[in-house]
Interface confidence: medium
Amino acid sequence: FERTRSLQDPCSNCPAGTFCDNNRNQICSPCPPNSFSSAGGQRTCDICRQCKGVFRTRKECSSTSNAECDCTPGFHCLGAGCSMCEQDCKQGQELTKKGCKDCCFGTFNDQKRGICRPWTNCSLDGKSVLVNGTKERDVVCGPSPADLSPGASSVTPPAPAREPGHSPQ
């Protein structure tokens, strides 16, 4: 199939980084500055994405690949290919229409993005609460009394009231 296609369509010989220029008898011409073609056989090159404003350049555009953006400090990416930047909040907060708000009691957020999530209900899993939750951290579930076989460690290290950093999901 590929061989047949190349006999019928000379453009299929044009590699990535070029385009098939109809104005020049279908000669493969390099993509102009600030444009790219990531696949062969293209009849046009695509304009490079420009990372402006709250976006910053993570990867420069080349003749064969588009630029990639991320967000300036204080913001994080949302959407495929970082199509949007959303404001960071502090751990223990979530972003609402009115800005960053503290997590309600019984919920936590251990990241600078996303929503406050309910503390885990340890009892649903037959466990007990080993360490209480905070706005920034989920509870830590411990074994149920039945799980503590003789000789098993039941020493609980002290948990700081407010711990630095964040715990991941």
Epitope: D110, T120, D138, V140, C141, V155, G165, S167, P168, Q169
Partner: antibody, heavy 119, light 107 residues
Framework: QVQLQQPGAELVRPGASVKLSCKAS????????INWVKQRPGQGLEWIGN????????NYNQKFKDKATLTVDKSSSTAYMQLSSPTSEDSAVYYC????????????WGQGTTLTVSS | DIQMTQSTSSLSASLGDRVTISCRAS??????LNWYQQKPDGTVKLLIY???RLHSGVPSRFSGSGSGTDYSLTISNLEQEDFATYFC?????????FGGGTKLEIK
């Protein structure tokens, strides 16, 4: 009992994307995070990212952000990890593992899928 | 990222011995430290979580201790099935990170 079932092996050509699966059983799928961990031959373990099946909320290790895409199918209690443009560097054992709550440990692991990237 | 260092990559011991495997974090991880065992066939199991809590079904010859940045796993009275590779992992900060592993071999 809790089980995370993974295919034993997958073979993929360089550049062709691959989707690894992890079928969960024996617990409420939507209540536990599914994580993916990479282990190269003779090497340590690397956390790739995780997904909360209830709402498909994901976290990624920055190192794998452009390589891995995590999804779930709640109807079949299966988690997936798609690897884009695989190279020989992606040849490894990939484990799925679960945990319940923030900071909790990985309490159950799949057997791992050995991915071979070769032409 | 928090770096987890297991300074001993392999360790030889005999049946009945008591061994201690250490793990150091590049910053305080407030006891959010877990230990796993990996058998030669690749099977991975949780042993200890939150520094010293024994996971259900794990024999009491396994114990964990530590605080701040320094943690350890102790296996007393080694049995044949304990010869495996042991990994520490921090659950404090994204991304979750593991130590490089300590392979426990029979002397």
């Amino acid at each position: 009992q809790v089980q995370l079932q993974q295919p034993g092996a997958e073979l993929v050509r360089p550049g062709a994307s691959v989707k690894l699966s992890c079928k969960a059983s024996g617990y409420i799928f939507t209540s536990y995070w599914i994580n993916w961990v990479k282990q190269r031959p003779g090497q340590g373990l690397e956390w790739i990212g995780n997904i909360y099946p209830s709402d498909s909320y994901t976290n990624y290790n920055q190192k794998f952000k452009d390589k891995a895409t995590l999804t779930v199918d709640k109807s079949s209690s299966t988690a997936y990890m798609q690897l884009s443009s695989p190279t020989s560097e992606d040849s490894a054992v990939y484990y799925c593992t679960r945990f319940h709550y923030g900071s909790s440990p990985f309490d159950n692991w799949g057997q791992g899928t050995t991915l071979t990237v070769s032409s | 990222d928090i770096q987890m260092t297991q300074s001993t990559s392999s360790l030889s011991a005999s049946l009945g011995d008591r061994v201690t495997i250490s793990c150091r974090a590049s910053q305080d991880i407030s006891h959010y430290l877990n230990w796993y065992q990996q058998k030669p066939d690749g099977t991975v199991k949780l042993l200890i979580y939150y520094t010293s809590r024994l996971h259900s079904g794990v024999p009491s010859r396994f114990s964990g201790s530590g605080s701040g940045t320094d943690y350890s796993l102790t296996i007393s009275n080694l049995e044949q099935e304990d010869f495996a590779t042991y990994f520490c992992q921090q659950g404090h900060t994204l991304p979750r990170t593991f130590g490089g592993g300590t392979k426990l071999e029979i002397k």
